[in-house]
C-alpha cells in the first residue's frame, strides 16, 4: 500500500496539482475521481480538474507528489499533544518512551545476536562444503571460479570475515597467490550482501514497506555486482589491486600490534556463546587440504584447554624423516625420533546449549537456522512496530530531516560523502557490515531513511568492514601479517574503486535505479524477491562453478552466447526507452516474444497456483498470532496480517473474525502495484504467493 507522501516545500508549478490524463493521483477515500482517457496519445489533454480533496491554497503551500511510490510516508501522530497532557499523563508518556527505548534496544540486541547465530548456523550447515570449495586447484588459473567460490562460500557461511580469513591463511601458507585471492575477496564482498536481503524479506507483509526495504537492501547487491562486473576484468588485465597493495605493504615496516578491538561483540558474545560456539579453524583446515579436519566437528566442546610442549618419542616412516642424526634410533621394530609435541589437555567444557548433545553439525545447524530465522523475523517485526509507534509526527519529521536533508548549497554534494563516513564509522563500531546494513533495512522499509541516503551509508559500510579487516591484519602473527594485510588492502581498494565508479556522479548511481526497479517488481510479485535471491546468490554462482570445473572451452562456449544475449537485450531495452523510432515497429516493444518471456504475470499465475493451498493456513496462523499479540499489549490495532490475508478474510468479516487493523500511517485506499501505476486494489490479482 502506498503511503501518503510527505508534505514538502511549495512548488511554483501549479500543473503539478492539476489532474490530467498523464498525471496520476490517489483515489481519495470519499470522492471518486474522473480520469480522462484518450486513444490518441499524441494529442495533449486540455481538460483539467482541481483535486476536490484540498483547497488550492493548501496545495500551493504544501504540494503532494503522490505519483512516486518511493516518497517517504508521513508517520502521523495520533496521540495527544504534550501540551494537552496533565502531569500524570506526562510522567506516563516519559515512562512509555523509556520503556519503548529499552524494548527497542533489547530487540535490536537480539536482532544482532540472531544474525551472529544465523552465521554460525550457516557455517554448521555449509561450512565444510565451503571449505572444500577452496581446496579446488583451478582457482589459481581461473579468476571467474575464484569469484564464484568467494560468493558461494560467503553465502554458505554467512560471514565474509570467515571466507577472508580462510583466504589469508591459504595465501600465508602458499596454497594460494595474492593474484588468485583477489577474485575470491571480490566474491566475498558480493556474498556478504545476502544477509540484509534476507532481512528485507521479513518485511514482505506490507507492499510499500517491502518495496523500500527490498530496494534498500539490494542496492548493496547491485553495487557489489556492478563493481565486480567492471573491476574484475580490469584487475585480470592490469593487476592494479595486486600491484598497488604490494607497493603499500612493501613501503611500510609493519610490526604486528594488538588485536583489533571487539566493540559490539563485547556485548553480544556473552549471549551468543551460550547458544553455540564454533571451532572456525576446522573450515580453514579443510580448505588447506587437511584430511583429519573433515571428520572434526565445528561445534566447540572444550573451551579451556592446556597446551604443553613436550619432547616425545614418535615413530617416523624412514630415516629421511628424522629431525637430526642425534635424535633418531630404532628399537629394532620401528624408527623413533624425538620431536617437540604440543600436547593438548582438555580442562573445561564450553558452556553452550549443544555441548552435551553430540548431534551432527548438520542437525545443530538446521536447529539454529530455524531458531535464528524465527528470532530474526520476530525481532525485526517488533523493531518495526516500536519504531512505527515512536517515529510519528514531530519525532519523525526531525529524524527524517536530519538523516535525509542535504547540506545547504553549495555544499549539498558533501552530504553523501559524510554519509559514507558515517556508514564506515558505524560499521567499524559494530564490526560487521552485515549487522549495519541489516539494521538499516527496516529503517528504509518504514520510511525513515531514503534509498538515496541509504546508498552512501551502505557504501560506507563496505569501507568500514575493510578497515576492520586492516586492523585485524595488523594484529595478525608475523607469518600471516604480509598476506593478510595485502588482502585486506585489496578489499579496501576494491571498495574505493567501486565507490569512485558508482557514486561521485549522480548519473552513475546505477545501483539505486536498479534496486528501485527490483523493488517495484518485488512489490508487485513478491515471490520474485526469493527468486532473485536464489538466482543471484546460488544458481548463477553454482552454474559458473560447474562450467568452470568443466574447463575453459565449456565456460566460454556457454558464457559467450549468454553474455551476447544479455548485451543484446540491454541494448534493445535502451533503444526502446530512449529512441524507439530507430527500431523496426516489431522491436519497439517485447510483444513479439511469448508473454512468459517478457512478463511475470504468467509466472505469477503458476506460482500462485502452487502456493495457494498454503495461503489459508498461513493467514489463519497469522490471525491467531495477531490476536495473541493484541491481547498481550492491550491494543486492538497493534498487529496486522498482509493484504493477501485481508482478501482471503473478506468473506469471513461477517462472522466476527478480526482482520488487519490499519495503522495510522497506512493509506487504506491506495495499492500501488508498480511504479507509476495507481488503482484500487483488485483482490484477485494483488494476492500473490508471498
Amino acid at each position: 500500500m502506498a503511503p501518503w507522501p510527505e508534505l514538502g516545500d511549495a512548488q511554483p508549478n501549479p500543473s503539478k496539482y492539476l489532474e490530467g490524463a498523464t498525471s496520476q493521483q490517489p483515489i481519495t477515500p470519499d470522492k471518486s475521481k474522473e480520469t480522462n482517457k484518450t486513444d490518441n496519445t499524441e494529442v495533449p489533454v486540455t481538460k483539467f480538474e482541481l483535486l476536490p480533496t484540498y483547497s488550492t491554497a493548501t496545495l500551493i503551500e504544501e504540494p503532494t507528489e503522490v505519483d512516486d511510490p518511493w516518497n517517504l510516508p508521513t508517520l502521523q501522530d495520533s496521540g495527544i499533544k504534550w501540551s494537552e497532557r496533565d502531569a500524570k499523563g506526562k510522567i506516563l508518556c516519559v515512562f512509555q518512551g523509556i520503556g519503548r527505548l529499552i524494548l527497542l534496544l533489547g530487540f535490536l540486541y537480539f536482532f544482532v545476536c540472531s544474525l551472529d547465530v544465523l552465521s554460525s548456523a550457516f557455517q554448521l550447515v555449509g561450512g565444510k562444503m565451503a571449505g572444500q570449495f577452496f581446496s579446488n586447484s583451478s582457482i589459481m588459473s581461473n579468476p571467474l571460479l575464484g569469484l564464484v567460490i568467494g560468493v558461494l562460500v560467503t553465502v554458505f557461511v554467512q560471514s565474509s570475515s570467515t571466507s577472508t580469513s580462510i583466504v589469508v591463511s591459504m595465501v600465508a601458507s602458499s596454497l594460494l597467490t595474492v593474484r588468485a585471492a583477489i577474485p575470491i575477496i571480490m566474491g566475498a564482498n558480493i556474498g556478504t550482501s545476502i544477509t540484509n536481503t534476507i532481512v528485507a524479506l521479513m518485511q514482505v507483509g506490507d507492499r510499500s514497506e517491502f518495496r523500500r526495504a527490498f530496494a534498500g537492501a539490494t542496492v548493496h547487491d547491485f553495487f557489489n555486482w556492478l563493481s565486480v562486473l567492471v573491476l574484475l576484468p580490469v584487475e585480470v588485465a592490469t593487476h592494479y589491486l595486486e600491484v598497488v597493495t604490494q607497493l603499500i605493504v612493501e613501503s611500510f615496516h609493519f610490526k604486528n600490534g594488538e588485536d583489533a578491538p571487539d566493540l559490539l561483540k563485547v556485548i553480544t558474545k556473552p549471549f551468543t556463546k551460550l547458544i553455540v560456539q564454533l571451532d572456525k579453524k576446522v573450515i580453514s583446515q579443510i580448505a588447506m587440504n587437511d584430511e583429519t579436519a573433515k571428520n572434526k566437528s565445528l561445534v566447540k566442546i572444550w573451551c579451556k584447554t592446556f597446551t604443553n610442549m613436550t619432547q616425545m618419542n614418535v615413530t617416523v616412516p624412514s630415516m629421511a624423516n628424522c629431525t637430526s642424526h642425534s635424535l633418531c634410533w630404532t628399537d629394532g621394530i620401528q624408527i623413533w625420533t624425538m620431536k617437540n609435541v604440543t600436547y593438548k589437555e582438555n580442562i573445561a567444557k564450553c558452556q553452550h546449549i549443544f555441548v552435551n548433545f553430540h548431534l551432527p553439525d548438520l542437525a545443530v545447524g538446521i536447529i539454529l537456522l530455524i531458531i535464528s530465522l524465527l528470532v530474526l523475523c520476530g525481532c525485526l517485526i517488533m523493531i518495526v512496530k516500536i519504531l512505527g509507534s515512536v517515529l510519528k509526527g514531530q519525532v519523525a519529521t526531525v529524524i527524517k530531516k536530519t538523516i535525509n536533508t542535504d547540506f545547504p548549497f553549495p555544499f549539498a554534494w558533501l552530504t553523501g560523502y559524510l554519509a559514507i563516513l558515517v556508514g564506515a564509522g558505524m560499521t567499524f563500531i559494530v564490526q560487521s557490515s552485515s549487522v549495519f546494513t541489516s539494521a538499516l533495512t527496516p529503517l528504509i522499509g518504514i520510511g525513515v531513511i531514503t534509498i538515496e541516503r541509504a546508498y552512501p551509508l551502505t557504501l560506507g559500510s563496505n569501507i568500514g568492514t575493510t578497515t576492520t579487516a586492516i586492523l585485524a591484519a595488523l594484529a595478525s602473527p608475523g607469518n600471516t601479517l604480509r598476506s593478510s594485510l595485502q588482502i585486506a588492502l585489496c578489499h579496501f581498494f576494491f571498495n574505493i574503486s567501486g565507490i569512485l565508479l558508482w557514486y561521485p556522479i549522480p548519473f552513475t548511481r546505477l545501483p539505486i535505479r536498479m534496486a528501485k526497479g527490483l523493488g517495484n517488481i518485488s512489490a508487485k510479485y513478491r515471490w520474485f524477491a526469493v527468486f532473485y535471491l536464489i538466482i543471484f546468490f546460488f544458481l548463477i554462482p553454482l552454474t559458473v562453478f560447474g562450467l568452470s570445473l568443466a574447463g575453459w572451452p565449456v565456460l566460454v562456449g556457454v558464457g559467450v552466447p549468454v553474455v551476447f544475449i544479455i548485451i543484446l537485450v540491454l541494448c534493445l531495452r535502451l533503444l526502446q526507452s530512449r529512441c524507439p523510432r530507430v527500431l523496426p515497429k516489431k522491436l519497439q516493444n517485447w510483444n513479439f516474444l511469448p508473454l512468459c518471456m517478457h512478463s511475470l504475470k504468467p509466472w505469477d499465475a503458476v506460482i500462485s497456483k502452487f502456493t495457494g493451498p498454503f495461503q489459508m493456513p498461513c493467514c489463519c496462523c497469522c490471525r491467531v498470532c495477531c490476536r495473541v499479540c493484541c491481547l498481550l499489549c492491550g491494543c486492538p490495532k497493534c498487529c496486522r496480517c498482509s493484504k493477501c490475508c485481508q482478501d482471503l478474510e473478506e468473506g469471513q468479516e461477517a462472522q466476527g473474525v478480526p482482520v488487519k487493523a490499519p495503522e495510522t500511517f497506512d493509506n487504506i485506499t491506495i495499492s500501488r502495484e508498480a511504479q507509476g501505476e495507481v488503482r484500487a486494489p483488485d483482490s484477485k490479482t494483488e494476492c500473490t504467493a508471498l
Epitope: W329, T330, D331, G332, I333
Partner: antibody, heavy 121, light 107 residues
Framework: EVQLVESGGGWVQPGGSLRLSCAAS????????MYWVRQAPGKGLEYVSG????????YYVDSVKGRFTISRDNSKNLLYVHMGSLKPEDMAMYYC??????????????WGQGTLVTVSS | DIQMTQSPSSLSASIGDRVTITCRAS??????LNWYQQKPGKAPKVLIY???SLQSGVPSRFIGSGSGTDFTLTISSLQPEDFATYYC?????????FGQGTRLEIK
C-alpha cells in the same frame, strides 16, 4: 634372575618348517621388546626379527621376510618364531634376546643359550 | 642398510695391555652404538650401550667412545677373562646390523 631358554631347534630338510620357542622368566615379559638373533657356524651375529611388547608390531630382516613369523604369548611368557620354507643359509644358532622397553634404542641386554637349527638334505 | 666395519678383524695382546677396537658405520648413526662380548660356545653379553654407557655389572676397564661414524671400544688393562670376540651393533636404523667381529686372543 633374568632367564631366557630357547627350544625347538633341530634338523630339517630345505623347504621344511620349524617352530622355535623362548621361555622367559625373572622379569615382566609383557613390558619388553623381544628379538631373535642368529649366528651361522663360524660367522658373526645377524639380527632376524623383533616384536613389540604388546605383540602388535613386528619387524623382519629382508632375508626372512614372508617366511618367518614372530609371535608372543604374554600370558605364558613365551616368544615364538615360526620358520617356513627353510633354506640351507638359515642354518644357524638361534638366540632369543631381550630388548629394552618400547621406544628405547635396541640393546640386547639378556640372551638365551641358543638353539641350533640345521637345514640340510 | 647400514654397514658396520670393525677393525682389526683379530688382535693379539697381553694381559695388562691397553687394547682399542674400532667400529665404523657407513653413515652417521649419532651415538646409537652398542658393544657386545661373546665367548666361544656362549651367548653374547652387552658391555656398552649408546656408545659410552657402561652396562651394569660390566667392569669399568671397558670404555666406549665416539659418535657419528667412528666409534672405539677401549680395554684399559686387559684381563684373562677379556679374551673373546667383540661385536659392535648399531641401533640407529632398521634393520639392526652388527660388525663382523674382532677376535681378541692372548699373545
Amino acid at each position: 634372575e633374568v632367564q631366557l631358554v630357547e627350544s625347538g631347534g633341530g634338523w630339517v630338510q630345505p623347504g621344511g618348517s620349524l617352530r622355535l620357542s623362548c621361555a622367559a622368566s625373572g622379569f615382566t615379559f609383557s613390558s619388553h621388546i623381544m628379538y631373535w638373533v642368529r649366528q651361522a657356524p663360524g660367522k658373526g651375529l645377524e639380527y632376524v626379527s623383533g616384536i613389540s611388547s604388546n605383540g602388535l608390531s613386528s619387524y623382519y630382516v629382508d632375508s626372512v621376510k614372508g617366511r618367518f613369523t614372530i609371535s608372543r604369548d604374554n600370558s605364558k611368557n613365551l616368544l615364538y618364531v615360526h620358520m617356513g620354507s627353510l633354506k640351507p643359509e638359515d642354518m644357524a644358532m638361534y638366540y632369543c634376546a631381550r630388548g629394552g622397553r618400547d621406544r628405547v634404542p635396541a640393546v640386547f641386554d639378556y640372551w638365551g643359550q641358543g638353539t641350533l637349527v640345521t637345514v640340510s638334505s | 642398510d647400514i654397514q658396520m666395519t670393525q677393525s682389526p678383524s683379530s688382535l693379539s695382546a697381553s694381559i695388562g695391555d691397553r687394547v682399542t677396537i674400532t667400529c665404523r658405520a657407513s653413515q652417521s648413526i649419532g651415538t646409537f652404538l652398542n658393544w657386545y662380548q661373546q665367548k666361544p660356545g656362549k651367548a653374547p653379553k652387552v658391555l656398552i650401550y649408546v656408545a659410552s654407557s657402561l652396562q651394569s655389572g660390566v667392569p669399568s676397564r671397558f670404555i666406549g667412545s665416539g659418535s657419528g661414524t667412528d666409534f672405539t671400544l677401549t680395554i684399559s688393562s686387559l684381563q684373562p677373562e677379556d679374551f673373546a670376540t667383540y661385536y659392535c651393533q648399531q641401533s640407529y636404523s632398521v634393520p639392526i646390523t652388527f660388525g663382523q667381529g674382532t677376535r681378541l686372543e692372548i699373545k
